[in-house]
């Protein structure tokens, strides 16, 4: 499950591209999520009313939230697996306040991979995709074990 140094390097290399436009990437990730898995939209009171992709693209709130999500994730990825301090509060809020199941974390992980594939193909071959998949898997695994401790059957 652990990533090698080379794999973390690949993850952070492509994440550098994401950081060049966090809101843009965040917006794309959330639009893919809401379009592909409309049930996830129910967890967001702010965005429930957004019906079409055009409405989603026009929403500043959605863009802002996308940036928040990816900024938090970036902070975790940069810890190269030593992310206990970052995961705990995130798991706490996602379990008790937002009630986000692990399945939704899988959905958003898929969307992140898809956005990276479409926006950065030259930096996202099989090796980088494999590494990013592993990093996101590690994140979900640790979120899930924190959920368990909190008694949330996500």
């Amino acid at each position: 499950m652990g990533l090698s140094d080379g794999e973390w390097q690949l993850v952070l290399n492509v994440w550098g591209k994401v950081e060049a436009d966090i809101p843009g990437h965040g917006q794309e990730v959330l639009i893919r999520l809401f379009k592909g898995h409309p049930e996830t939209l129910e967890k967001f009171d702010k965005f429930k009313h957004l019906k079409s992709e055009d409405e989603m693209k026009a929403s500043e709130d959605l863009k802002k939230h996308g940036a928040t999500v990816l900024t938090a994730l970036g902070g975790i990825l940069k810890k190269k697996g030593h992310h206990e301090a970052e995961i705990k509060p995130l798991a706490q809020s996602h379990a008790t306040k937002h009630k986000i199941p692990v399945k939704y974390l899988e959905f958003i992980s898929e969307c992140i991979i898809q956005v990276l594939q479409s926006k950065h193909p030259g930096d996202f071959g099989a090796d980088a995709q494999g590494a990013m998949n592993k990093a996101l898997e590690l994140f979900r695994k640790d979120m899930a074990s924190n959920y368990k401790e909190l008694g949330f059957q996500g």
Partner: antibody, heavy 117, light 107 residues
């Protein structure tokens, strides 16, 4: 210069296991992934999987999960593939190859495995 | 899995000829495409990586082009030592996959 020296050809019985080796020289072993590739007689190339010598991180082709196990010994700069529950389908030449960004830039000479009773 | 369709499967040409081998990917692989040659005795060598980059020590008569789903390997001024089987390989997604090979013979 970069070299990957593979172990000698092997004749094994059906149901048995075999462990093939690939000794690297001429570069820093832990800096590059090692891939393993299968080639059946007169056939094309099939990717089995890859391993990162610096962290034992592996990726397998689903088709070979449960059949192949990739390991490394960094002290001797050697990569290994163990093939289990062998059948005639596993009779093939097995190659190790060094990888740089999804391309295999140096290949071993191959080890022929024949499964026969 | 990404399928790699290579053509032709065999090819006969004369010394000095220019030949082209094509590889078609079942989905967009951008430039994650490598070309290899394999000679009798299982000697396998990388020729081209990332669609068009010549690997160290490979003669300049070899060239690669393409992106997305269509790729070509061109060998100009064919030499006797070019007799081999040529394979393409995609590096866009796991599992890594190879084309079926093109066996090149001299007329």
């Amino acid at each position: 210069q970069v070299q990957l020296q593979q172990s000698g050809d092997d004749l094994v019985k059906p149901g048995a296991s075999v462990k093939l080796s690939c000794k690297a020289s001429g570069y820093t072993f832990t800096s590059y992934w090692i891939n393993w590739i299968k080639q059946r007689p007169g056939q094309g190339l099939e990717w089995i999987g890859r391993i990162a010598p610096e962290g034992d991180s592996t990726y397998y082709n689903e088709m070979f999960k449960g059949k192949a196990t990739l390991t490394v010994d960094t002290s001797s700069s050697t990569a290994y593939i163990q093939l289990s529950s062998l059948s005639s389908e596993d009779s093939a030449v097995y190659f190790c190859a060094r990888e740089v960004r999804n391309a295999m830039d140096y290949w071993g000479q191959g080890t022929s495995v024949t499964v026969s009773s | 899995d990404i399928q790699m369709n290579q053509s032709p499967s065999s090819l006969s040409a004369s010394l000095g000829d220019t030949i082209t081998i094509t590889c078609h990917a079942s989905q967009n692989i951008h430039v994650w495409l490598s070309w290899y040659l394999q000679k009798p005795g299982n000697i396998t060598k990388l020729l081209i990586y990332e669609a068009s980059n010549l690997h160290t020590g490979v003669p300049s008569r070899f060239s690669g082009s393409g992106s997305g789903t269509g790729f070509t390997l061109t060998i100009s001024s064919l030499q006797p030592e070019d007799i081999a089987t040529y394979y393409c390989q995609q590096g866009q997604r796991y599992p890594l996959t190879f084309g079926g090979g093109t066996k090149l013979e001299i007329k």
